[in-house]
Interface confidence: low
């Protein structure tokens, strides 16, 4: 088997966003720009006045889904010895079903409020064996990768580069990256996954 | 929609063989790299072998030169030929193509026993 011929494709399935992490462990996503979850309906944090129709549900009943995604996991030419599975989330946090308005004649999504994403909640941290081409030594790397998703209140504050949807990320091109027949990025599959159907 | 539809699992002796296949929709299949995983009871999914879309292979070592990955791009089908099966080769085996969002197959159930 001709199994050392992995640099033709090692960039398959770079994920820019993948973070070399310096300790090994479990650990939640830092919380300082989320707020409770359990403040939802307070009138301070964005509560609804009394007569609005949407009955409040636990933020746990919504359809936050964690998908599996299976890649390498690339640094520079290296790709690791083994392909690398994390979770990705998926889905919206909040009503799934119209509402009637106030006057009845319509239909409305949920009104701005409380903004509630599915988003990482807790990561973990993978240790991976690089390899890479020129006979260069293996290198030992600590890769950063989402282990649980979650609905979570955003503030302002909250870091919107989080909040990229995966499936609209990920139909869209790669910028200044020329496609080559082997080195197709996990973008560009799941761009091929969705003119497929 | 992804479908990921493993057979070929079984109850086999030690030194035995067994073929699985993976049979997938919902995707070009010819453009992606399917790997094969297994899961042994209280253990992690772990990495068996992968075919790139060109046909280069790759294994884990505890399965080289006894596991054989193959593709048939006209039949959106992988297969994982297993020879010289041992014990701690029971697991159930799951294939999926790398870089795609997708839930997992069901899976097929390999047993060896000694």
């Known amino acids: 088997h001709h199994h050392h011929h992995h640099h033709q494709g090692w960039q398959a399935f770079k994920n820019d966003a993948t973070e070399i992490i310096p300790e090994l462990g479990e650990y939640p996503e830092p919380p300082p720009e989320l707020e409770n979850n359990k403040t939802m309906n307070r009138a301070e944090n964005g509560g609804r006045p009394p007569h609005h129709p949407f009955e409040t549900k636990d933020v746990s009943e919504y359809s936050c889904r964690e998908l599996h995604f299976t890649r390498y996991v690339t640094d520079g030419p290296c790709r690791s010895a083994k392909p690398v599975t994390e979770l990705v989330c998926s889905g919206q946090c909040g009503p799934a079903r119209l509402l009637p308005n106030a006057i009845g004649r319509g239909k409305w999504w949920r009104p701005s409020g409380p903004d509630f994403r599915c988003i990482p909640d807790r990561y973990r941290a993978q240790r991976v064996q690089l390899l890479c081409p020129g006979g260069e030594a293996p290198r030992a790397r600590k890769v950063r990768l989402v282990a649980s998703c979650k609905c979570k209140r955003l503030t302002r504050f909250h870091n919107q580069s989080e909040l990229k949807d995966f499936g609209t990320e990920a139909a869209r091109p790669q910028k200044g990256r020329k496609p080559r027949p082997r080195a197709r990025s996990a973008k560009a599959n799941q761009a091929e996954l969705e003119n497929a159907y | 929609e992804v479908q990921l539809v493993e057979s070929g699992g079984g109850l086999v002796q030690a030194g035995g063989s067994l073929r699985l296949s993976c049979a997938t929709s919902?995707?070009?299949?010819?453009?992606?790299?399917m790997s094969w995983f297994r899961q042994a009871p209280g253990k992690q999914r772990e990495f068996i072998a992968t075919?790139?879309?060109?046909?280069?292979?790759d294994y884990i070592d505890s399965v080289k030169g006894r596991f054989t990955i193959s593709r048939d791009n006209a039949k959106n089908t992988v297969y994982l030929q297993m020879n010289s099966l041992k014990p701690e080769d029971t697991a159930v085996y799951y294939c999926c193509p790398l870089g795609i969002e997708y839930a997992w197959g069901q899976g097929t159930q390999v047993t060896v026993s000694s």
């Open positions: 075919i790139f879309s060109g046909g280069d292979t």
């Open positions: 919902g995707f070009t299949f010819s453009r992606f790299d």
